[in-house]
Structure formats: C-alpha cells, structure tokens
C-alpha cells in the first residue's frame, strides 16, 4: 500500500532486555526513518503476548494511557512532538512481568510497524560459603557448603579442589516468589590430610560481571597422630643432655602430653617438659623405650621410641644428640 519505491521505515529495539526484580527497566523502542523518507506517527502501542488489550498507548491527541498507570511511563513521547521514540519504563519489576512485549508504531503512509522484545526479570543472588566441620567418618560426608540465595535464574555453582571429592547440588524456592536458592555441598572422605586445606566455590550468574569465588578452609577433627623425634641412634655416655620431642598433629589441638616408659614411670635421668623429654647425661649404658601419650578432645594416641646410650667416645663433644 505505500507508494512504490518507498524506502521502508524500521522499528529498532533489542531482542532481549534484562531487568532486576523490584527495580525499574526501560524497554527501548525507536522508529528509524531513512534519510529521504517521511512518515507520520499517530499512535504508539505496547502490548504483551498472551494478554488481552494493550498495556500502554500514546495517542497523538489523547496522550498516554496505561493499563497500570503507577507502573508504566513513556520515557520520551510527548504531545506535540514527533512520535519516534516509544521507549517504555516499567517500575517495580515483578517475576510475572517476564515475557514477550510488542512495540508498535501506527504510521502514515507506511502502515503499522512493530517489533518484539523479550523482557527477562533477573534477581541477583547473595552468595555464602562455609565449612562443614567433620570427624573421621570413613565415608563421604559434606565438608563445605556453598549457598546462592534468591537468584533468578538459578545461579550455577561449581567447585575447584585438589583434594578429590564430588559436589551435591540442590535447588529450593527463594524467599521472593520466582527466585531460587541453590545449595551445593562438597563431599569427600575426611582425613587428617584434608584438615586446613581449602576448596573454592565458584558461583556464576547473568547478573555478575565475573564469577564469584568463595574459598573455604576445611576442618576435619581427628585424634592425635603421634611420632617422637630427636634421636639419631648415636647417643653415648658422657655426652651433654639431649631432647626428645613428641610431635603430634591433631584437631583440636592436644590438651596434654604424658611421657612414660614401657617399664612404667620415667627414670630419674628423663624429665618431661610438655611435648619435650629432657634426657640428662648418664654414666652407664641404657636401653629404654619411651612412650609419649598425647590427648585431645577426640581421644589419646601414643608413640614409642627405644633409646640406646652406648659406651665409647662421643663423636662430637657437644652432646648426645645433634639436635
């Protein structure tokens, strides 16, 4: 119907517009008229797919009309001006606002021209990560928990770990209707080697410029792992005093160290000082097995070490031990 050879007018708009739940968003829509072309716009209309009637109309003489006047507003259209910008602002975005919208220009002589825009309603999630403190269970248990609360669409959670293990991820409705809370657990078989190590939770969401990384330091509670150090098999009579150290790894920390021998209490030349055992010089050879018993909240574990003090000249006059 337009005159032959007429360059066509084009309605310009993005195919998709994101907006945040509770915020306002502008649906941009413009009429582009080629250089030599002329057009007369009499009405701008916005309607939503699947709904009866139009949600917003700007009429050349009647001005704007809205289905929800408090929530809608033409950004640039004004009475007495050329109606080339149909951009519509929506306030207080709701989940149910997500959908397809049509922006339409009623023009002369070209006729009606329209474009569809998909409005996506997003909600930015809040992310937290926390350790799940565990004991040595011997079977896989959650050791870390990562929660992305109130996202729309749901956030995507992945884990990065050098410790092995596997994720267990679930979704539940968020506090606000239409939002989703994603919970991901990192599951592995706890061991003392895992205690104090870290895993990283990576949360990805459309609303983030870059993924959020949350590091969790793992906690595994275990009874003491005990060894005794300080003896090098070369202790001799007449050497200076030497020291044995009871090395204990545990979580929580050891609450007590107890030194003894296989024969019972410590001999007079051995003096306990917490984690250390002081061996004073002796004048005759000995062959004694020392026991260090370490206690923490989860139990007690012990280690044994047999010490021989031999006759013969010391290799180094400085003492029985090179400690």
């Amino acid at each position: 119907w337009p005159p032959p050879g007429t360059g066509d007018i084009i309605v310009q708009a993005p195919t998709q517009v994101p907006g945040f739940l509770g915020d306002s968003v502008t649906l941009p829509c413009y009429l582009q008229v080629p250089g030599m072309e002329e057009t007369h716009v009499s009405q701008l209309t916005w309607s939503r797919h699947g709904e009866s009637g139009s949600m917003a109309v700007f009429h050349q003489t009647q001005g704007p009309n809205y289905s929800e006047p408090k929530r809608l507003e033409f950004v640039a259209a004004r009475l007495g001006t050329e109606l080339r910008d149909a951009s519509l602002r929506m306030f207080g975005l709701r989940v149910e606002d997500e959908g397809n919208y049509t922006c339409l220009f009623v023009t002369f002589p070209q006729g009606s021209r329209s474009v569809d825009i998909w409005l996506r309603v997003l909600a930015k999630p809040q992310n937290t990560a926390e350790v799940q403190k565990v004991q040595l269970t011997g079977k896989p248990v959650p050791v870390a928990r990562c929660v992305s609360t109130g996202g729309r669409p749901p956030a995507h959670i992945t884990w990065h770990s050098d410790l092995g293990g596997m994720p267990n991820t679930s979704q539940a409705p968020g506090f606000l209707s239409g939002t989703v809370t994603v919970t991901s657990l990192w599951i592995l078989v706890p061991s003392s080697q895992v205690d104090g190590k870290s895993v990283t939770c990576k949360v990805e969401h459309e609303s983030f410029e870059k993924p959020q990384l949350l590091t969790v330091n793992l906690t595994v509670y275990y009874p003491p792992e005990v060894s005794i150090s300080g003896y090098d098999n070369n202790w001799y009579l007449s050497q200076n005093e030497a020291t044995l150290t009871c090395d204990a790894r545990s979580n929580p920390e050891p609450t007590g160290y107890n030194w003894s021998t296989t024969m019972g209490p410590l001999p007079p030349f051995a003096v306990a000082q917490g984690a250390q055992l002081l061996i004073r010089p002796v004048d005759k050879p000995i062959n004694t097995t020392f026991i260090c018993n370490v206690t923490n909240a989860l139990g007690a574990r012990q280690a044994e070490l047999t010490v021989q003090v031999k006759e013969g000249p010391p290799s180094e006059p400085s003492g029985m031990s090179s400690n």
Partner: antibody, heavy 116, light 107 residues
C-alpha cells in the same frame, strides 16, 4: 475547536467528475493526515485513502485507485478529493476525517448523487 | 483485506440495560481497533481507540475490550441518547476496514 467543513451536496451525471473539499480549522493542518471515507446509503463505511498535508504522501485503498485522487492546499488548510468516471455506484455520502490512527474528527459529510 | 464481522446487526434494548456489540477480525489486528457512534443524520464520532481506551469526553458507560481477533464494545446503563449505529474499525493494516455496523434501538 477542531472543525472539518465539507462542501455541499453534488448532483452529477454518469461519466463526469467531481471535487469535494474539506476545509479545516482549530488545529495545525500539516500535523495530521486527512483521510476520506465513503458511506453508501444504508451501508457501512469504506476507507478510500489518506494524504499527509505536509509532503503530499498518499495511501489509497486499492479499490479506489484510479477512482479517487487526494490533494491538499496548505495555504487554505483544505483537503480535496476528486472522483472521476462516476457511476451510480459512486452515489454515497463522503466524509473527510482527521487521522490519529483512528479517526478522531469527521466532516459533516458530502452527499454525492450520480444520476441522469 | 481484513474483514471485520460485526454482530448483531440490530439490537433493541431499554434504558438502564447493558448491551454488548462484538467485532471479529479475519486476522490478528493486535489492539488497533476503534469504535464509532453514528447518530441518525450525523457523521461518525470516535468513542474508543486502541481497542479499550476512551476518548476524552466519552462517558465511562462505554467500554472497549479485546485484542487479536475478538473485540467488544459494551454500553452499561444504556441512555436514550445512545440511540445510534455503532461501527468497529481496524487500523492495523491497509486497507483500513470497518465492521458492518450495529443499530441500537431504544424500546
């Protein structure tokens, strides 16, 4: 007050031509497209076409191409429709109507009778 | 061309009643529909544009609704001055077309 004043009734012979006028007042003539609508006796309305006074752009209903010609005179804020090769089928009331997508103001109508 | 099928053709009602006129488009016209009132011996007067919006000065007893292909003009609490013929019109695509009209008679 917006007014569209049309020329008076016409009685013409078959084969002749006629030019109906629509003088406007109360608004800026060049800001609105002017359209023409036909209403045959006891019948519905038929859109003939429209013209934009600013640049003379027109759009016609295919059924009236060759039958109707739309023009404007900006200096007098008047729109015209010429109908040619008239037959009894063209006997009707013709309205000019200001276009705002729909038609918000109408002239009082011009009765055209084509008869021998 | 888009055909606008209007019904009924005639309607008789009493003052205070509620009446509805329907218009069915042969294809989707969105909300680009207007309703007009033509009183005997007068030119048409615009009542509704964009399917549901009243022109300023039009009494709120006139209500338009619909989109796509099905449209309705409802007059609630009919008054004697509503005696007229009512037309729907689509302006979604050329050529613009009108419904056949509904004559409202007041008993």
């Amino acid at each position: 007050e917006v007014q569209l004043q049309q020329s008076g009734p016409e009685l013409v012979k078959p084969g002749a031509s006629v030019k109906i006028s629509c003088k406007t007042s109360g608004y800026t003539f060049t800001e609105y497209t002017m359209h023409w609508v036909k209403q045959s006796h006891g019948k519905s309305l038929e859109w003939i076409g429209g013209i934009h006074p600013n640049n003379g752009d027109t759009s016609y209903n295919q059924r009236f191409k060759g039958k109707a010609t739309l023009t404007v005179d900006k200096s007098s804020s008047t729109a015209y429709m010429e109908l040619r090769s008239l037959t009894s089928e063209d006997s009707a009331v013709y309205y000019c109507a200001r276009w705002t997508g729909d038609f918000d103001y109408w002239g009082q109508g011009t009765t055209l009778t084509v008869s021998t | 061309d888009i055909v606008m099928t209007q019904s009924p053709k005639f309607m008789s009602t009493s003052v205070g009643d509620r009446v509805s006129v329907t218009c069915k488009a042969s294809q989707n016209v969105g909300t680009n529909v207007a309703w007009y009132q033509q009183k005997p011996g007068q030119s048409p007067k615009a009542l509704i544009y964009s399917a549901s919006y009243r022109y300023s000065g039009v009494p709120d007893r006139f209500t338009g609704s619909g989109s796509g292909t099905d449209f309705t003009l409802t007059i609630s609490n009919v008054q004697s001055e509503d005696l007229a013929e009512y037309f729907c019109q689509q302006y979604n695509s050329y050529p613009y077309t009108f419904g056949g009209g509904t004559k409202l008679e007041i008993k």
